[in-house]
């Protein structure tokens, strides 16, 4: 199919810095021990929300908000001695750009949270 | 500079699902709340390993490994009637590919661990 | 124009230093990563280190780990090569290169290639 008119060419000298990247992924199927087992058991339980971008590849990426602002101690109640607090990590994703071309990306990072784990507050002490 | 034969092409026919992805990465400087404060602090603590490959983009990514079978109660020792389980994420990063070619990359997943979180054990009863 | 000029090659005497620099014009360095390679008079070129474009992390072939040190200044469009313990067989015409990305151990991976700079070490 013909190039989308304002799409960017590889050869484009306005457009230096392009790679061809083949989205045929490798370890398609990486065995992911989904945390989805864990999200409940936790003593800092998170619910998991769907982020989606149908320009952004991948276009479906869960995101991590922790339940309670304390820990959920042996007997189920919420503890505020302790926090629950997201564990974050960058990660890349293609981003389409111009957003009408077919296949021309953007490199772009994007924080996500993962899951929450229970922490010890630091106690600031007034003078 | 001329193509390297056997290099890809965007007009490739065999190479369907090449795209090109623009460098000039956005967000580059994410405000990453870097867990390296609550590795430390989690009742779930953990160690963060550098796995480091020079041909990947991006080239180090950290691995969070769980400290303790068990996890850290308000004491600090180890309680094992809970156990630290690693938050697993699946990530995308780039390889060259063809590994001579200048700019042709494919993306490929990795599942990373990114911290611990403590859960309640699954406990199987035997009849 | 593109290209990349290294600089700082020269005579020095076994055991001494030399500071090699490679700029970059006509394009920025921030999504290459850079690599040194050597080649001395009858041998074939080899790699001898690179940095990243992600986050600066650097390797090294054996014969040079511990005494080269490379480094990146992404504002002045510049890498280096700082070589310490200088030995007669460091003597070689010094090449730095851009490849987009990632370090690669294939020479075709480098977009771009400089003239060479002549490191002589010798008593």
């Known amino acids: 199919s013909p190039q989308n008119p304002g799409c960017p060419n590889a050869e484009d000298k306005n457009f230096p810095r392009t790679v061809m990247v083949n989205l045929n992924i490798r370890n398609r199927n990486t065995n992911s021990k989904r945390a989805s087992d864990y999200y409940n058991r936790s003593s800092s339980p998170w619910n998991l929300h769907r982020n989606e971008d149908p320009e952004r590849y991948p276009s479906v990426i869960w995101e991590a908000k922790c339940r309670h602002l304390g820990c959920v101690d042996a007997d189920g109640n919420v503890d505020y001695h302790m926090n629950s607090v997201p564990i974050q990590q960058e990660i890349l994703v293609l981003r389409r750009e111009p957003r009408h071309c077919t296949n021309s990306f953007r490199l772009e990072k994007m924080l996500v949270s993962v899951g929450c784990t229970c922490v010890t507050p630091i106690v600031r002490h007034v003078a | 500079s001329p193509q390297n034969p056997g290099c890809p092409n965007a007009e490739d026919k065999n190479f369907p699902r090449t795209v090109m992805v623009n460098l000039n990465i956005r967000n580059r400087n994410t405000n990453s709340k870097r867990a390296s404060d609550y590795y430390n602090r989690s009742s779930s603590p953990w160690n963060l390993h550098r796995n480091e490959d020079p041909e990947r983009y991006p080239s180090v990514i950290w691995e969070a490994k769980c400290r303790h079978l068990g996890c850290v109660d308000a004491d600090g020792n180890v309680d094992y009637h809970m156990n630290s389980v690693p938050i697993q994420q699946e990530i995308l990063v780039l390889r060259r590919e063809p590994r001579h070619c200048t700019n042709s990359f494919r993306l490929e997943k990795m599942l990373v661990s990114v911290g611990c979180t403590c859960v309640t054990p699954i406990v199987r009863h035997v009849a | 124009e593109v290209q990349l000029v290294e600089s700082g090659g020269g005579l020095v005497q076994p055991g001494e230093s030399l500071r090699l620099s490679c700029k970059a014009s006509g394009f920025s360095l921030d999504y290459y990563a850079l690599g040194w390679f050597r080649q001395a008079p009858g041998k074939e070129r080899e790699g001898i280190s690179c940095?990243?474009?992600?986050?600066?992390?650097?390797y090294y072939t054996d014969s040079v780990k511990g005494r080269f040190t490379i480094s990146r200044d992404n504002s002045k469009n510049t890498v280096y090569l700082q070589m310490n313990s200088l030995k007669t067989e460091d003597t070689a015409i010094y090449y730095c290169?851009?490849?987009?990305?990632?370090?690669?151990?294939?020479?075709?991976?480098?977009?771009?290639w400089g003239q060479g700079t002549q490191v002589t070490v010798s008593s």
């Open positions: 290169a851009a490849a987009l990305l990632t370090c690669s151990s294939y020479y075709d991976a480098y977009t771009y």
């Open positions: 940095i990243t474009s992600s986050d600066a992390s650097a």
